[in-house]
């Protein structure tokens, strides 16, 4: 079942999943000036069985230059800033190492995809938190959150992490060195 809400937000931290449970949706979103093609699903889906899982549907973006755009839309302040164009897979070596039954790896990038990936997780999904560049992790427990079903409602457990001070970013499970990105994880590898 889909989790109703997004994972908790931790100040000065980002999160990512190491692998994605079957049923997870990844919205097919495109960067500015592009839009998803009309044919095909509006999202990719992690699907399969216990022995093999993969992403169903392929996201495709097409130029919207020749299309009519709606003038009444006023951009939000944060959208007026120039967004960094991080190469999606440059820092996802970890996802390539995992092969959990009933889970999908990080999907490969598609041309002109949005800089932020929007996932919709399912019950049982775990996401891992990491402090952004310049902040140090104070752990009171696991720096992770799990989507659980309680009394018919979904909820995310609270990660036991505080990010404070000036130091190198902490690491996700299994990573050898801190991330090189000036902002810790690229935006595209977090979810909202």
């Amino acid at each position: 079942e889909l989790c109703d809400d997004d994972p908790p937000k931790i100040t000065h931290a980002t999160f990512k999943a190491v692998a994605y449970k079957e049923g997870t949706m990844l919205n097919c979103e495109c960067k500015r000036g592009f839009r998803r093609i009309k044919s095909g699903s509006p999202y990719m889906l992690c699907t399969g069985n216990s022995s093999h899982s993969s992403w169903d549907n392929q996201c495709q973006c097409t130029s919207s230059a020749a299309r009519n755009t709606t003038k009444q839309v006023t951009p939000q302040p944060e959208e007026q800033k120039e967004r960094k164009t991080t190469e999606m897979q440059s820092q996802m070596q970890l996802a390539d190492q995992v092969s959990l039954p009933g889970h999908c790896r990080e999907p490969p990038p598609w041309e002109n995809e949005a800089t932020e990936r929007i996932y919709h997780f399912v019950v049982g999904q775990t996401v891992y938190y990491q402090c952004v560049q310049g902040y140090r992790a104070l752990h009171r427990g696991p720096a992770e959150s799990v989507c659980k079903m309680t009394h018919g409602k979904t909820r995310w457990t609270q990660p036991q992490l505080i990010c404070t001070g000036e130091t190198e970013p902490s690491q996700f499970p299994g990573e050898e060195e801190p991330q090189a990105s000036p902002d810790g994880l690229p935006e595209s590898e977090t979810s909202r």
Partner: antibody, heavy 114, light 107 residues
Framework: QVQLQQSGAELVRPGTSVKISCKAS????????LGWIKQRPGHGLEWIGD????????NYNEKFKGKATLTADTSSSTAYMQLSSLTSEDSAVYFC???????WGQGTSLTVSS | DIQMTQSQKFMSTSVGDRVSVTCKAS??????VAWYQQKPGQSPKALIY???YRYSGVPDRFTGSGSGTDFTLTISNVQSEDLAEYFC?????????FGGGTKLEIK
Amino acid sequence: QVQLQQSGAELVRPGTSVKISCKASGYTFTNYWLGWIKQRPGHGLEWIGDIYPGGGYTNYNEKFKGKATLTADTSSSTAYMQLSSLTSEDSAVYFCARVTPASWGQGTSLTVSS
Amino acid sequence: DIQMTQSQKFMSTSVGDRVSVTCKASQNVGTNVAWYQQKPGQSPKALIYSASYRYSGVPDRFTGSGSGTDFTLTISNVQSEDLAEYFCQQYNSYPYTFGGGTKLEIK
């Protein structure tokens, strides 16, 4: 929690226009496509079109081109559908809905009558 | 446009029974099908996405299956609150289209 709150019922004259609103909350409005659906008894559900508020991109069902105009105001997280040159055929309940994951507004009843 | 056909407009069942609502697409839509439940005077509520995955809060007595052109929504152990109309929808190609609906009546 995702919520889509639509404007109230409308009773309008034939030949006029109407603008229905849909205020979104509980998610990032600019990141999701938002669709509009028409429901008439005996005619089922019809997809009118959808809009991506983050860029203002729109898709229209050919059947509703020239009839419906979709817009969005990101500052208020509100989507709008304007229906023009109204006739009795436009009398229906209109829903706004986030495309995926699906979540629907409560509907707006439109009656076109002289 | 892709046509979604729900051949049974009405289905009658009893509490505790198992009922299957079917939907046929006029062409292959993969698993890009959703199922909705609409109770009288309410807006449609999403039950199933991608043919077989339940939305949160949807009781596990609702099960979706199928791919390609034939899809089924099965309600096992029917409850009185399941009295509603059920619609299928394809979102494989634009415009997204809906089935005509199947009204479930409880005997």
